[in-house]
Interface confidence: low
Amino acid sequence: IIPVEEENPDFWNRQAAEALGAAKKLQPAQTAAKNLIIFLGDGMGVSTVTAARILKGQKKDKLGPETFLAMDRFPYVALSKTYSVDKHVPDSGATATAYLCGVKGNFQTIGLSAAARFNQCNTTRGNEVISVMNRAKKAGKSVGVVTTTRVQHASPAGAYAHTVNRNWYSDADVPASARQEGCQDIATQLISNMDIDVILGGGRKYMFPMGTPDPEYPDDYSQGGTRLDGKNLVQEWLAKHQGARYVWNRTELLQASLDPSVTHLMGLFEPGDMKYEIHRDSTLDPSLMEMTEAALLLLSRNPRGFFLFVEGGRIDHGHHESRAYRALTETIMFDDAIERAGQLTSEEDTLSLVTADHSHVFSFGGYPLRGSSIFGLAPGKARDRKAYTVLLYGNGPGYVLKDGARPDVTESESGSPEYRQQSAVPLDGETHAGEDVAVFARGPQAHLVHGVQEQTFIAHVMAFAACLEPYTACDLAPRAGTTD
Amino acid sequence: IIPVEEENPDFWNRQAAEALGAAKKLQPAQTAAKNLIIFLGDGMGVSTVTAARILKGQKKDKLGPETFLAMDRFPYVALSKTYSVDKHVPDSGATATAYLCGVKGNFQTIGLSAAARFNQCNTTRGNEVISVMNRAKKAGKSVGVVTTTRVQHASPAGAYAHTVNRNWYSDADVPASARQEGCQDIATQLISNMDIDVILGGGRKYMFPMGTPDPEYPDDYSQGGTRLDGKNLVQEWLAKHQGARYVWNRTELLQASLDPSVTHLMGLFEPGDMKYEIHRDSTLDPSLMEMTEAALLLLSRNPRGFFLFVEGGRIDHGHHESRAYRALTETIMFDDAIERAGQLTSEEDTLSLVTADHSHVFSFGGYPLRGSSIFGLAPGKARDRKAYTVLLYGNGPGYVLKDGARPDVTESESGSPEYRQQSAVPLDGETHAGEDVAVFARGPQAHLVHGVQEQTFIAHVMAFAACLEPYTACDLAPRAGTTD
């Protein structure tokens, strides 16, 4: 498909001249950021961004690649080096430590320097590193965590927890020996390490004692509470704050977000991770966009400003399943949340960053025609005389042999939300990838986001922009917090 | 491997604070660029950049990812959308038209708007678009093309040619009907469309009549001249310029580059593409770094400045073969050329851009330990109880089944320069990928390189920075060319 207007060189020359004009007008703001938002697309490498752009565009009846994601509109871009101290290809724990705390750690550890060792409880103490969210709270800002995964998952946990094992969601996941040594599960740290004003996502089961039925799935024992210590962490959290509210469904969330008496809000909408956007029951569970909006309504009441972490956490899960349909529809919802946040905040006082913790071994090739489905087939046949999809994985569970050969695929099969794209190597779960990821920035001090940087730079830019420790002498005007 | 110094949070905090300091000091230059250099890594997607960084670092006895490529040091980064008008995933012809001429074209066409149709000679006339190199020449600058492919290949051809078929290297490749309609082969256009001061790369055989033995391979008929029109294009080119010199080996190149009487230089070092860096006979063929240096020595004599195109063109070829070793060693030589150019020019007056035309379905995953070989195996086994490499391809010639199963691989096999990484889909040649690629920028007006842009933006930034058409009223001081 060749759009007639694109045949004319003037179309491209005019468009580029306009882009140049916009570039020339960009003026680095010399002010501090009152508010900080970091949007984290878990596993959202550059190949995912491009494929999601095309899909989002095609959902709006465009050809695809010429359209803009909300994140594409951010004026500054950098590349972020995601390796962990011990691995070329990292996990979401070590990376969360980097972009939220400003220090690189080891694979599968969270909120700890690399002096800590995975799974060795006795290496925790003394190696804790402090997140920007924690520092924002100390500076009098309101803070929030929003995610489509469980709120105790690796990425959000980087904002508040310190653990040598990212899998220690509740005390039932922590070995007795580690519990005896004083290592706390992540759910416990969520309510006790610091005062978080807004907590929205999944993860109900880790907050309640074993045997507590889940309110949404009361007959499913596997969805009920998991805690061995008998604690009801939600109850403990509610008891800490006069204006605290706990909700577990969309209706309650929307009510609470509009209630001026609510100062602290915890919404846990699934026992574990939230459902994929394509499976979400919109009467029961809020979307990431809705959770983001609710969080912003509450947090923006604070005249000193806020820090908000928003994660599209299941982009990663779709990729691990080699189901690109899931990964890309999650990316679109993540981008919708970015767009909504942009409407509810001002780039005059809010530094917004969009990035990924790492990428995936996910590729988009095969020379498909413009306007063809991102989930479709490449033109022509492979060497084995069979069709193949434009989306593929390097490794993952999509690998299958049928009668000792690669199976054929049709356009209708490949377009299914359940279809697993093929891979070169068979794994139970497709792996992360180690290439640099993009950082998109808008707002005060966004111009500092440039070039190729270590992932740790992200936390430091946020801290500097809002004059948080260790950059309290940031020399930016107006100084953060002067509006109260 | 965990470096002891990296266990200390101070290591990361200090490093990030320094990076912040550097970011704060960045001052957009308000001057015009006297010189323009575009470094084009053919097929150099972000995954290639990261993997090459690790390899280059490890060749210097470092762990790898913490090191810097020369391009990593460029202060500004943007993302470039590479699709062609008719394809989501483009080729090197349509993309060359975009980044060199500022207009998007159709797959496999060069220097033509999308009104032209692939292989249809009669759609050429009237649809030609003019490259920045051509405009630089008009403005009195010296211009040059340096590549590791044949100089008539798609990417360099974007600087000087207009053709509906990128494969029309010599007249022997052009159908008689198209020749009768007046469509010229690329080699002819190389010497006749415009005055190019420096031409360095491969492509001898397209310049000489059929039956002309090649000077390096006189006994190999297949390497000799291919032209049917009986023309000796080198002779014709030499006759155009008093100070023109033709060379075909490294010794002659080095001599010519230091000879003040040489005003125009054509060096063609192989009959077709130049050899991969790992196969290069360093007594006969220059490296890309050496060709770049030679070009800069000649071009920098012009007080009005220069335009130089430098292509690491065989990164792409290594990937098409699914031989990551070749792709990554080519990328390192490309980066070495960037580094050398940086030493020979000043960012005060030279705008340098580094980018790729497109990416490849190449991924780097599997959670390898830091410091482990980029060509090595992932820890653990795949679901078929066999080893697998961290580098893999979505599709390509590395696909293989042995007794109806994926073959095992050892570290020594995967480390071989000839090893083809496995892929999900069997193809004769691995395909390009459609995700955005990075643009790195340094020098006057480099700050305009920001955000997510159409690939066409690159040509416009260069034209604007040097006050070339259509931006002659660029309002930058000092205006380009005022030093003569």
């Epitope: 084995d384 050969a405 690669r406 | 696909y399 089944l401 007794d403 109806g404 096999e413």
Partner: antibody, heavy 126, light 110 residues
Amino acid sequence: QSLEESGGDLVKPGASLTLTCTASGFDFSSYYWICWVRQAPGKGLEWIACIYGGSSGSTYYATWAKGRFTISETSSTTVTLQMTSLTAADMATYFCARSLYTWRYADYAASTLNLWGPGTLVTVSS
Amino acid sequence: AVLTQTPSPVSAAVGGTVSISCQSSQSVYNVNLLAWYQQKPGQPPKLLIYETSKLESGVPSRFSGSGSGTQFTLTISDVQCDDAATYYCAGGYSSSKDNSFGGGTEVVVK
């Protein structure tokens, strides 16, 4: 799993002959390369041609064999080798063999033949 | 490509070790696509080793292969009477026209 060649005969110089390779216990649609290799009396092995099973149409020939020899898949269990303009130099035992790999270029087939037929003798004499 | 093998015959004592070399005029594909076949009179060849050093199933571990690029060796240790045969190397190359077998090396067991 086995292979068996047939069609070997005594023919005069200049004649044509078709050899057949029949598979038992597997079929060619399982995507194997099937190759013909010959061995002149008292001499070494010489690769002739390969075909990729499964009606793919992919064939590869030794330079000397192209034009005079044609390899074809005639059914899911039979592959033939048509030989024309036979000379005394073509007198040999002809083997058909299956590649170890179900996916490899034929370029490598000679180095991966793990299932062979017993051979069939072609004699060229006037 | 031309594959040159150790000239025939090569003598080996029972229980001893024998090595046969194979030199290729150009590098085999992936530097390892070289195989060794054993052929006894009146029988078809039998694949012993593929990809330089990988033992085909059912082949005794007394047979081993080594080498890379253009130089390869087949080693038979603890030689048995049953090992008396002609051994051929065969190379796979990046172009099918270069596919070839070596001339063969006869091993005589005493």
